[in-house]
């Protein structure tokens, strides 16, 4: 259902001071400027809806320009507790504490928040990414070391009058950016506490948050150029489907990935692409300005709606799932990587999806909204879309029930 009913004051409208407060690019994440401590230390922090810790570099590291120096903050409090976060690849570990935190281009408030001071890491910080920490915006259930560590956004809402909602507009450039261009470029907006009408077109459509851990949603149908993949919808959500700004690609469960690639290959068969392209290993290139977008299909994900037996669909273009990559060896061409990949942990709607849409994380009403982003990359023939309603039966059966184990996968 679209969201046109009246809202409480301050919930909607214009948030000029927060527009354009993100920088970065899909391949290395989007970051917001934050200040920590007294006097304030400025850091760039990755916006990650796929984790729940606020963690910042707090020791020298070859990939960090700067780091949080706790000894220089008069308001730092040590929690005398360590935290260790392993990933499938890599890890970070650090010491827990609290300090005063604010977002210069965010709400005009300062909150005392938990901070993990990262003292050691492996395969976490990215060379040239320009961020020094991570802001985990998901729920306490997946916080480390356990769910008693209050996430930043919970602290923000508790300590201020900021409504329990944020929204993200991630703007993919549509062309590769070099380091100086990234530093100068606008990457999008994180609107804390509300929705900015200028950032989207059309209507917002909402899907329920299935469970408050990750931002888990339910996909009920997948189409490639309007052709149904015709899989048992449980496969689309095996073992979960999440919205994750800290992941680059659209990641799909193995069976779904294989079916989707087969269908995309068939739709784009006028050109023969190497197997390595579909694996994300080989680039495909065309003479500058001649990328044949029209030969690639659109991809539609149908999401459970707010009303029984009702769904809506979000549709992305090849401009979202072919990621521009700069390579000096082929600099005369426009080159791309296939940004859909295989997952063993369920569907991850990463930057590839989010760059098409304005995404509202309405925690207060346990739902996620999608509208066409005012900054998405498209051509004169096709545009990303959010459309509905569609009648879909037995959508509850599409959810997969995970056997209970402690699980947290960040920045995969």
């Amino acid at each position: 259902e679209t969201d046109e009913e009246p809202e409480e004051p301050g919930r909607r409208g214009s948030f000029v001071e927060m527009v354009d407060n993100l920088r970065g690019k899909s391949g290395q994440g989007y970051y917001v400027e934050m200040t920590v401590g007294s006097p304030p230390q400025t850091l760039n922090i990755l916006v990650d809806t796929g984790s729940s810790n606020f963690a910042v570099g707090a020791a020298p590291h070859p990939f960090l320009h700067r780091y949080y120096q706790r000894q220089l903050s008069s308001t730092y409090r040590d929690l005398r507790k360590g935290v260790y976060v392993p990933y499938t690849q890599g890890k970070w570990e650090g010491e827990l504490g609290t300090d005063l935190v604010s977002i210069p281009h965010g709400p005009n408030v300062t909150v005392r928040a938990n901070i993990a001071a990262i003292t050691e890491s492996d395969k976490f910080f990215i060379n040239g990414s320009n961020w020094e920490g991570i802001l985990g915006l998901a729920y306490a259930e997946i916080a480390r070391p356990d769910d008693s560590l209050e996430p930043f956004f919970d602290s923000l809402v508790k300590q201020t009058h900021v409504p329990n909602l944020f929204s993200l507009q991630l703007c993919g450039a549509g062309f590769p950016l070099n380091q100086s261009e990234v530093l100068a470029s606008v990457g999008g907006s994180m609107i804390i506490g509300g929705i900015d009408h200028s950032l989207y077109t059309g209507s917002l459509w909402y899907t329920p948050i299935r469970r408050e851990w990750y931002y888990e949603v339910i996909i009920v149908r997948v189409e490639i150029n309007g052709q149904d993949l015709k899989m048992d919808c449980k496969e689309y959500n095996y073992d979960k489907s999440i919205v994750d700004s800290g992941t680059t690609n659209l990641r799909l469960p193995k069976k779904v990935f294989e079916a989707a690639v087969k269908s995309i290959k068939a739709a784009s068969s006028t050109e023969k692409f190497p197997d390595g392209f579909w694996l994300g290993e080989q680039l495909v290139c065309w003479q500058a300005g001649t990328t044949p977008w029209n030969i690639f299909p659109v991809i539609s994900l149908y999401l459970m709606g707010e009303v029984t037996n009702q769904s809506f669909r979000i549709t992305i273009l090849p401009q979202q799932y072919l990621r521009p990559v700069e390579d000096v060896a082929t600099s005369q061409d426009d080159c791309y990587k296939f940004a859909i990949s295989q997952s063993s942990t369920g569907t991850v709607m990463g930057a590839v999806i989010m760059e098409g849409f304005y995404v509202v994380f309405d925690r207060a009403r346990k739902r996620i909204g999608f509208a066409v982003s005012a900054c998405h990359v498209h051509d004169e023939f096709r545009t990303a879309a959010v459309e509905g309603p569609f009648v879909t039966l037995d959508m509850e059966d599409c959810g997969y029930n995970i056997p209970q184990t402690d699980e947290s996968t960040l920045m995969t």
Epitope: N127, E271, K272, E281, V328, C335
Partner: antibody
């Protein structure tokens, strides 16, 4: 400037193992896969396998699956190839190469000599 | 595995000549073929990708052509520094495979 710096020549005994390295610079390391190749006189170039530095995913030529193991250390932008149970057949020049379209960049070569 | 066959092992040309090095794939590889030059004691150098596209910095006397199964690298106005082995490679499917090479000698 993109560079792939390979480790120096190795003289090893039959049955032993060796670990070759390839340090990358001049580009975003996690954006491109690294491949390893073998060249023996009169036998042309053979593709051994490849690794994705962003997540350590590997894919091997079936012929080298029991011989080579590829690993990566992103903190130093270095890829490694471990060759085990060496025989005289493994005496060769080994290259690392970076993906893109095909292999636009190659390392400078590492000579491995297996001799008692 | 896809076989890449370079039937001519050696070619001898004079400076200023035009030379065509051929390569045949055992099955259709589209345009997913690259060409490399390797001088004695050195690493291969990338010349051509996607059958006919020159990598940045490669002199325009090197041109590639072909698709499907038959591919050609042409060097027009051969120079003495072109003395080298030339290899084709298919990157259409795994495992990636190379031709056996063609040695260009300068008379």
């Amino acid at each position: 400037e993109v560079q792939l710096q390979q480790s120096g020549p190795e003289l090893v005994k039959p049955g032993a193992s060796v670990k070759l390295s390839c340090k990358a610079s001049g580009y975003t390391f996690t954006n491109f896969w690294i491949h390893w190749l073998k060249q023996r006189p009169g036998q042309g170039l053979e593709w051994i396998g490849m690794i994705d530095p962003s997540d350590s995913y590997t894919k091997y030529n079936q012929k080298f699956k029991a011989k080579a193991t590829l690993t990566v250390d992103t903190s130093s932008s270095t890829t490694y190839m471990h060759l085990s149970s060496l025989t005289s057949e493994d005496s060769a020049v080994y290259y690392c190469a970076r993906s893109g379209v095909a292999f636009p960049y190659w390392g400078q070569r590492t000579l491995v000599t297996v001799s008692a | 595995d896809i076989q890449m066959t370079q039937s001519q092992k050696f070619m001898s040309k004079s400076v200023g000549d035009r030379v065509s090095v051929t390569c045949k794939a055992s099955q259709n590889v589209g345009s997913n073929v690259a060409w490399y030059q390797q001088k004695s004691g050195q690493s291969p150098k990338s010349l051509i990708y996607s059958a006919s596209h020159r990598y940045s910095g490669v002199p325009d006397r090197f041109t590639g052509s072909g698709s499907g199964t038959d591919f050609t690298l042409t060097i027009s106005n051969v120079q003495s520094e072109d003395l080298a082995d030339y290899f084709c490679q298919q990157y259409n499917s795994y495992p990636y495979t190379f031709g056996g090479g063609t040695r260009l000698e300068i008379k």
